[in-house]
Each structure stands twice: as structure tokens, then as C-alpha cells.
């Protein structure tokens, strides 16, 4: 994990003739903000969803009013960095899009209007942990100067943020074969040797010797799909590539897309498909016209001469979406049902199912308890698409197959001693207490706060807890 950081140094007219008109005027004061979109890999042809590595919006810059007759200077910029956190490894090669947006602050009905001033894009190689890289990009008559870097979040280190660092166990040096973690010389690189046999695809470890499973996988070596029902295709052995994944709540829960945008999950986050006339990571930007160049990937913009009339993007072959922002790829046919996430593995597609669904296409609604046996007299409790067993006394685990130690939770109060029994537990109460769990004090006059003990049992005798 780590953060990609972008520092905008200046945005203003580029060198050469044809200086651009100032984007702001006395009648229409405005301020700038920036959006960065990151995709892994160098190839613009990659069938990655937009901003698969992440995206960020800057704060709004200071309000700027053009001085009459003066050429457009470098425009005042927002404070601070644009930060795009990444959860997985830093890919080393990435594509970026940086957009400069203008927010007009005149007397617009319905609040400020946004329009796209410039968009620059590029492809770069960058190692995490390295120094700031400087760049200059031109978009028409505008010039954008910026720096960027990728840095790892502790305990991750390395050029891809995949190595972990741990505090030294000994003050003098790191263990055998382990290097100090530059620049944290007081820490050592952790040897990430997972448990032998831990699935390299579905398991990982943060401590040596462990095997933690990715969402949807289970078992000591993370080789068992959480649901294997109907996971095999009619085509025989190759079908083993389709694990059925059943993760928990997704990034689209609660629909982060504004203005009627529809949300779809991407491998790392979410993506909004905006209705016409809206734009931005969460469809939060409106008032876009053809003059703003809203059509990506060579799309042709038609109509939309003013913010009140919607534009239409006619997309070139291979692209779709209201802004031609989506590549038509093999997931575009939506093979995954019930909100499942489609992943193109190259040799096959895989569906990552939402909670409560399973099957290669997430087509099976998991009737929580159907076909689920709870062992040893346990009863199945339905809930949220994931069955749960309520186990009989003395048993535990997901399917009540594990013998539980009924005394492990120290159920006997007031110093009572617990004894495991074939039908549960027995509490031997300390003098002065009674009850199945020794929870009731015995009154000094011999009467208790409860009805009298059953015949044959004196207060203080062990009582069976059923």
C-alpha cells in the first residue's frame, strides 16, 4: 500500500504565440481545481477500467479575477498535494490524466458552473520511494508544470511497496539474510515466507509462516473457494480457473454516484457511469458543453452548445459510455449477475460475487441454510447471505464440527469452578453462591434470592447447566 502524490507547480499560458484568453473575468470570477486519474500499465490500449489505480480531486484554488487588458498570467493554484492512495502493489508503470477545471463564481442560477479547461495525459515509469519527478505538459495553449512521486505507507517498502519492515528485535543488526530498511535504518526487512503451500493466488501473509486468505477463499492454505457450488464449467479441467468468490459489502453500497449515476465495482474501487450532462469521478460535475471537450478517446461531441442543452458523445469503435470513457472489453457484456464484479484474466473471465451469491456467474442466490448441515445437533441460522450455525453445547466452529471447551469462557461466577460435562458444563459454586452459573448469592438466613434449590441439591452443590 502507498500513496501517489501530485504537486501542481503552475498552470498558465505556454510559450509561443497565441496566448490563451484568461479563463476568468471581472464579470465572471473563477477558481481552478485539478483532477488526477491513474491507470496501471503503460498501454492506453489496456482494457483497464478508468482510473483503476485511483483518482483524486484537489481543493479549489483562490478566486481569481482578470485584470482588464493584462495577459493571462499563471493562475493561482489550490494549496496542497493531490493524493491518490493505492491499496495493492505500486505497478511501476502507469498512465495518468490530469484535468484542469474552472469553477465560475458569477451569478449562475443553481450555483457555480464547472468547465474543463485543459486535459493532459502521459505514460510513465516510476519506482515507489524515489525522488519527486518533474514534468511539463502542454494542452493547446496552456502549460501545466507538476511533480509527482509514489511513496509506500509503513510497514511497506521497496520500489513496488511489497516488502514489509518491522522494528529490529536486536539493537545491533538485522537477522540472518535480512537487510536494514532504508531509509528506516532502525527497522529490518521482514522475511515474508508464508506457510508452506499457501496459495500464491488466493493467500498472502503479513507475518512469516501465516497464510491469510483473500476474500472468497478459505482453508488453511486458501485453496478452497468459500462457495464451490456450480463452480465448474461444462468444459472439464480448465474450469478450475473459475473460483466462485463471495465477498462482503462492496464499494458501491450506498451508491457513491451523484445525479443519477449508476455505480459498478472495479477490481480496486468503483466507477460511476454518469447520465448525459454530468461528469466527474462521482458524476458531481455539471454544466459541461462540447466546448469543454467532454468526449474521451476521440469521441465526437454533438449538440450541447450551452450548459442547458445536453451534449452527446458519438464514440469511436471500441469505446462506450456517455463520455466514451469506457473501453468495450469482454466484461462489457456483463456476464456476472446480481452485482458481481467481472475480472478479465486473459484466458478466462471470472466473476467476484457479492455476499449472498455464488456460481461462476454469481447466478445462485445462496438460500442461506439450503443444503447446509450443522453437525452435532446445531441449527442453521439465516442471515445476510451467509449461513451461521448455532451450535449445541460442547461444539463450535462454522459447522459445529469442532469440540468446544465449555469452560473456556469462564462461565462460573464468583469464583465457582467449572467442569466440562458430556452435556455441557457444571459449575461448582464457592460457598455463599448458587445457581447454574453461581450467579446468585445465598442469603445469610439460608433463604436464597431464587426459589429453593431442587430436592437433593444443597446450595453449593454442583448444578448442571443445560
Amino acid at each position: 500500500a502507498g500513496v501517489f502524490e501530485l504537486q501542481i507547480h503552475s498552470f498558465g499560458p505556454g510559450p509561443g504565440p497565441g496566448a490563451p484568453r484568461s479563463p476568468c473575468s471581472a464579470r465572471l470570477p473563477c477558481r481552478l481545481f485539478f483532477r488526477v486519474c491513474l491507470k496501471p500499465g503503460l498501454s492506453e490500449e489496456a482494457a483497464e477500467s478508468p482510473c483503476a489505480l485511483g483518482a483524486a480531486l484537489s481543493a479549489r484554488g483562490p478566486v481569481y479575477t482578470e485584470q482588464p487588458g493584462a495577459p493571462a498570467p499563471d493562475l493561482p493554484l489550490p494549496d496542497g498535494l493531490l493524493q491518490v492512495p493505492f491499496r495493492d502493489a505500486w505497478p511501476g508503470t502507469f498512465s495518468f490524466i490530469i484535468e484542469t477545471w474552472r469553477e465560475e463564481l458569477g451569478d449562475q442560477i443553481g450555483g457555480p458552473a464547472w468547465s474543463l479547461l485543459a486535459r493532459v495525459a502521459g505514460r510513465r515509469r516510476l519506482a515507489a520511494g524515489g525522488p519527486w519527478a518533474r514534468d511539463i505538459q502542454r494542452a493547446g495553449a496552456w502549460e501545466l508544470r507538476f511533480s509527482y512521486r509514489a511513496r509506500c505507507e509503513p510497514p511497506a517498502v521497496g520500489t513496488a511497496c511489497t516488502r514489509l519492515c518491522r522494528p529490529r528485535s536486536a539493537p545491533s543488526r538485522c537477522g540472518p539474510g535480512l537487510r536494514p530498511c532504508a531509509p528506516l535504518e532502525d527497522e529490518c526487512e521482514a522475511p515474508l515466507v508464508c506457510r508452506a503451500g499457501c496459495s500464491p493466488e488466493h493467500g498472502f501473509c503479513e507475518q512469516p509462516g501465516e497464510c491469510r486468505c483473500l476474500e472468497g477463499w478459505t482453508g488453511p492454505l486458501c485453496t478452497v473457494p468459500v462457495s464451490t457450488s456450480s463452480c465448474l464449467s461444462p468444459r472439464g479441467p480448465s474450469s478450475a480457473t473459475t473460483g466462485c468468490l463471495v465477498p462482503g459489502p462492496g464499494p458501491c453500497d450506498g451508491n457513491p454516484c451523484a445525479n443519477g449515476g449508476s455505480c459498478s465495482e472495479t477490481p480496486r474501487s468503483f466507477e460511476c457511469t454518469c447520465p448525459r450532462g454530468f461528469y466527474g469521478l462521482r458524476c458531481e460535475v455539471s454544466g459541461v458543453t462540447c466546448a469543454d471537450g467532454p468526449c474521451f478517446n476521440g469521441g465526437l461531441c454533438v449538440g450541447g452548445a450551452d450548459p442547458d442543452s445536453a451534449y452527446i458523445c458519438h464514440c469511436p469503435p471500441g469505446f462506450q459510455g456517455s463520455n466514451c470513457e469506457k473501453r468495450v472489453d469482454r466484461c462489457s457484456l456483463q456476464p456476472c449477475r446480481n452485482g458481481g464484479l467481472c475480472l478479465d484474466l486473459g484466458h478466462a473471465l471470472r466473476c467476484r460475487c457479492r455476499a449472498g451469491f455464488a456460481g461462476p456467474r454469481c447466478e445462485h442466490d445462496l438460500d442461506d441454510c439450503a443444503g447446509r448441515a450443522c453437525a452435532n445437533g446445531g441449527t442453521c441460522v439465516e442471515g445476510g447471505g451467509a449461513h451461521r450455525c448455532s451450535c449445541a453445547l460442547g461444539f463450535g466452529g462454522r459447522d459445529c464440527r469442532e469440540r468446544a471447551d465449555p469452560c473456556a469462557a469462564r462461565p462460573c461466577a464468583h469464583g465457582g469452578r467449572c467442569y466440562a460435562h458430556f452435556s455441557g458444563l457444571v459449575c461448582a459454586c464457592a460457598p455463599g453462591y448458587m445457581g447454574a452459573r453461581c450467579e446468585f448469592p445465598v442469603h445469610p438466613d439460608g433463604a436464597s434470592a431464587l426459589p429453593a434449590a431442587p430436592p437433593g441439591l444443597r446450595p453449593g452443590d454442583p448444578q448442571r447447566y443445560l
Epitope: S233, S238, S332, Q334, G346, H347, C351, P360
Partner: antibody, heavy 120, light 107 residues
Framework: EVQLVQSGSELKKPGASVKVSCKAS????????MNWVRQAPGQGLEWMGI????????IYNHKFKGRFVLSVDKSSNTAYLQISSLKAEDTAVYYC?????????????WGQGTTVTVSS | DIQMTQSPSSLSASVGDRVTITCHAS??????MGWLQQKPGKAPKGLIY???NLEDGVPSRFSGSGSGADYTLTISSLQPEDFADYYC?????????FGGGTKVEIK
């Protein structure tokens, strides 16, 4: 046994419309995409488009956008290709072919083909 | 669009011959391709999927190989029923595209 049975030959005048059907049996209709492929007389194969019968989502070859519409009727396990404003150059054999929606993506079973002749 | 260049466009061979047909994609397609056989007046029939896997019921004399952008269909010992047209098809990217076809004729 998997079968794709297409409707019979059609003779149409220019400007008319035609709807070719492809009835599927022997498998779960919604688990496989349906492709449509055109073969003009003496020519090779040309991919027209694809439909996901479960959702109705379609993707067309840009050459076949506009006058060509793919659709399905899930209740009868039937896929359709409709061509409007027919032209002489639409004269061809039209095939439907199923394709696994997740794994190997092969077009493994094909309909027998429907010949559409456009002539005045 | 991905172009699929198939060669040769036709070939003459005798029963028992080993026949090789090649297909070159204009960009890498990661094995997402297949081979089809079409006999006159009939619908195409799937032979090979995913570059090298035999469709059900296809005789083992047919085999596919290749990776990246270059793929080959081999018939190890040509039989009388194998005289037909053969097409490659890529399904790595929309629109799917077919090779121009290879006509295998009796010498």
C-alpha cells in the same frame, strides 16, 4: 444435445425488413452469449455482433450499427437478428453461434444458417 | 480492430499429408482464438478453442498451437472428410475478427 435451429430462407425487396430467429435447446440459454455472423456469397465470415441473453446487453461490430438489431426472448430460448432497410449487399447467409460467457469464449455450436436474398 | 491474416489462402494436398495453416494477429491475443471448419453449403463447426484445445468430438489428428500473435492449425494426417475451408477467429477483443480462410483441396 445442443442445437441451434434457425428460421428458413427469406427473399426480400430492397427497403424491406427481415427478422431471423435462432432457437436454442439442450443447454441453459442464458449461460451462453449468442453471436451473429454473416457470410456473403463466396466470401469469408464476418462477425456482426453479440448479445447476452440474460441481460439483453449487446455489442455490435461498428460496421453493423444502425440497421441491425439483436434481441432475445428468454421465455422461448430464441435469439433474433432484425435487419431493416434491406439493401442488395445484405444478401448473405446469416449464422447464429453460441459462446461460453466466461471460460474459453469459443463459438462451439452454430445454427445451420439462414439465407437472406435481397432483390428487386 | 485486430486483423487476422491467414495463410495460405488455399492449398492442395493428398490424403495422409500433414497440413499446416497459420494465422497472424495484428497484435497479441493471448490465446483467445479458435479454428473453424466449414464444408460447402454447411455451417462452420468449431475445431479448436483457446488456441490449442480440441472441441468435443473433434478427431485428435487436428491440433492447435501458438501464442502471442501467431497461431497454427495442424492436421497430422489428412483424411478425405477434411477437405474444406478453415477459418481462424480471434475473440480477444471486440469486434471479433476472422481470418480470410484457407481452402484445403484434393491434389
Amino acid at each position: 444435445e445442443v442445437q441451434l435451429v434457425q428460421s428458413g430462407s427469406e427473399l426480400k425487396k430492397p427497403g424491406a425488413s427481415v427478422k431471423v430467429s435462432c432457437k436454442a435447446s439442450g443447454y441453459t440459454f442464458t449461460d451462453y452469449y449468442m453471436n451473429w455472423v454473416r457470410q456473403a456469397p463466396g466470401q469469408g465470415l464476418e462477425w456482426m455482433g453479440i448479445i447476452n441473453p440474460y441481460s439483453g446487453v449487446t455489442i455490435y461490430n461498428h460496421k453493423f450499427k444502425g440497421r441491425f438489431v439483436l434481441s432475445v426472448d428468454k421465455s422461448s430460448n430464441t435469439a433474433y437478428l432484425q435487419i431493416s432497410s434491406l439493401k442488395a449487399e445484405d444478401t448473405a447467409v446469416y449464422y447464429c453461434a453460441r459462446q461460453d460467457s466466461l471460460l474459453d469464449y469459443a463459438m462451439d455450436y452454430w445454427g445451420q444458417g439462414t439465407t437472406v436474398t435481397v432483390s428487386s | 480492430d485486430i486483423q487476422m491474416t491467414q495463410s495460405p489462402s488455399s492449398l492442395s494436398a493428398s490424403v495422409g499429408d500433414r497440413v499446416t495453416i497459420t494465422c497472424h494477429a495484428s497484435q497479441g491475443i493471448s490465446g483467445n482464438m479458435g479454428w473453424l471448419q466449414q464444408k460447402p453449403g454447411k455451417a462452420p463447426k468449431g475445431l479448436i478453442y483457446h488456441g490449442a484445445n480440441l472441441e468435443d468430438g473433434v478427431p485428435s489428428r487436428f491440433s492447435g498451437s501458438g501464442s502471442g500473435a501467431d497461431y497454427t492449425l495442424t492436421i497430422s494426417s489428412l483424411q478425405p472428410e477434411d477437405f474444406a475451408d478453415y477459418y481462424c477467429v480471434q475473440y480477444a477483443q471486440f469486434p471479433y475478427t476472422f481470418g480470410g480462410g484457407t481452402k484445403v483441396e484434393i491434389k
